[in-house]
Interface confidence: medium
């Protein structure tokens, strides 16, 4: 979690003098409670916007917007604390709006915005706006919170952001997998425009099981410039194990921008259809039924969200 360093955030507006300050997320009013405190924010909205840095990078940012309730408590409103918590790491970042003048009227609804929190693809955040001073112990809460889920790099608008491009989001390998005779798989994919090596990771599973029955890793050396954007064809030999028939092929690139941490793409080949034979009646009743019916072939990312389907 970090803040954009450019342009400098602004919270001043007509009728209000205000400055944005870094915050420790522990406002003084927690330690020294005040008697009279303002009401909570109204209509908190968080949206995904994008910001260009001075260096020309494009980053996803959380655009935070809220309004004030039209009550007399604005007379005691001294500012606001904005907090963003990344849920998977518990990392928190805060800023404070410090009002340098008093709000004295509601001629128009007061609206505040802040768009300087840089967020990461495929992460969930809790965004909280606290009005200051914070309430006395056991006082009514004067904050509003909302969760905010950032799309992953597969999303059209996220794909061109710097963090996504750095992890290889623009590379579409268009993987095809073909089952050959004599226990072989032919894997074909499109190389990216970088002289870097790739790894093909093959994991095979029995029908309807998630414990692997065969694993194999194949190294593909860095292509020459004339091979960029060309198809690479690799034939993998499978172990002759009856029933070890569902194969997941994962391609891991090692681009200079992401090294060992690049987005992987995978394709799955399902087991061939079984002929209809009467099943023996089990002498026990299973507690649950495994779900069946996967597609013949799918090309998807390493999180398993299907982003291409090809049937053959």
């Amino acid at each position: 979690l970090r803040l954009l360093d450019f342009p400098a955030p602004v919270c001043a507006q007509e009728g209000l003098s205000c400055r944005v300050k870094n915050s420790t997320c522990l406002d003084d009013s927690w330690i020294h409670p005040r008697n009279l405190t303002p009401s909570s924010p109204k209509d908190l909205q968080i949206q995904l916007h994008f910001a260009h840095t001075q260096q020309g990078d494009l980053f996803p940012v959380a655009h935070i917007e809220w309004t004030l309730q039209t009550d007399a408590s604005i007379l005691y409103l001294e500012g606001a604390e904005l907090s963003v918590l990344q849920l998977n790491t518990n990392e928190r970042l805060c800023v404070r709006f410090e009002f340098l003048s008093k709000l004295r009227h509601h001629h128009r609804r007061w609206r505040f915005t802040f768009s300087h929190f840089v967020v990461d693809p495929d992460q969930e955040y809790e965004v909280t706006v606290h009005h200051l001073p914070k309430p006395i112990p056991d006082g009514d809460p004067n904050h509003q919170s909302k969760n905010f889920l950032v799309p992953d790099c597969e999303h059209a608008r996220m794909k061109v952001t710097t963090p996504c491009m750095s992890s290889g989001s623009l590379w579409d390998p268009n993987i095809t997998v073909e089952t050959l005779e004599a226990h072989q798989l032919r894997v074909s994919f499109t190389l990216w425009n970088e002289s870097t090596h790739y790894q093909i990771l093959l994991t095979s599973f029995p029908h309807m099981e998630n414990h692997s029955c065969f694993e194999h890793m194949h190294h593909i050396p860095a292509p020459r410039p004339e091979e960029f954007h060309q198809r690479s064809n690799v034939t993998l030999t499978l172990r002759n194990l009856k029933g070890c028939c569902r194969h997941q092929v994962q391609i891991q690139p090692f681009f200079s921008s992401c090294l060992n941490d690049c987005l992987r793409h995978s394709a799955t080949v399902s087991c061939p259809e079984m002929p209809d034979t009467p099943e023996p009646i089990p002498d026990y009743m299973p507690l649950w039924e495994p779900r069946s019916g996967s597609s013949d072939y799918k090309d998807d990312d390493d999180k398993g969200s299907s982003h291409h389907h090809h049937h053959h």
Partner: antibody, heavy 131, light 107 residues
Framework: QVQLQESGPGLVKPSETLSLTCTVS????????WNWIRQSPGKGLEWIGD???????NYNPSLKSRVTISVDTSKNQFSLKLSSVTTADTAVYYC?????????????????????????WGQGTTVTVSS | DILMTQSPSSLSASVGDRVTITCRAS??????LGWYQQKPGKAPKRLIY???SLQSGVPSRFSGSGSGTEFTLTISSLQPEDFATYYC?????????FGPGTKVDIK
Amino acid sequence: QVQLQESGPGLVKPSETLSLTCTVSGGSISNYYWNWIRQSPGKGLEWIGDIYYSGSTNYNPSLKSRVTISVDTSKNQFSLKLSSVTTADTAVYYCARDGELANYYGSGSYQFYYYYGMDVWGQGTTVTVSS
Amino acid sequence: DILMTQSPSSLSASVGDRVTITCRASQGIRNDLGWYQQKPGKAPKRLIYAASSLQSGVPSRFSGSGSGTEFTLTISSLQPEDFATYYCLQHNSNPFTFGPGTKVDIK
């Protein structure tokens, strides 16, 4: 209320460059993507490309070699240039704004959706390619 | 490119009928889909966003459903002003693509 207005010549000669401008009124061009879409006579809709207010562009690969989209934030305008036109480029050309995200809430708990899509359109301008 | 298909390509219906139009994507697009109505000589107008959310100002007789690859637009009780062509649009991955359209005319 944001409104979009396309402008430019209605007749372009084959092999020349088609140039159109979209003027945004009633709102800022900032923080949105701005799209060009076209519709050939009696045909469906085809997305040409888009531009972010900062100048970052995305183009339809089928037209990429001939398309340039640019933005002028000071005038609240964005423009389309399509080079080497043929009669197949005769169409109604629309500009459209890519909508902001919409958040809405399900029963008991929230559900947040990332939404982009064209929510505000210009009325369209007809461009005929003919000698 | 993601190919969007619509069915039927045209249909004839009467005022008061329930009308259902289906849109299919050639690969999963989550809920990144909108439905648009277009009348002759006019720009498309958005009816539904995020696959199932009703655009502000659009009558509640329009509804959308679906996720992934299959989506549906339903008009619960067709009105005279609903005779038009309807398009779906995926905005999940570039290039954004429209369905070929479904023309709804008077029976």
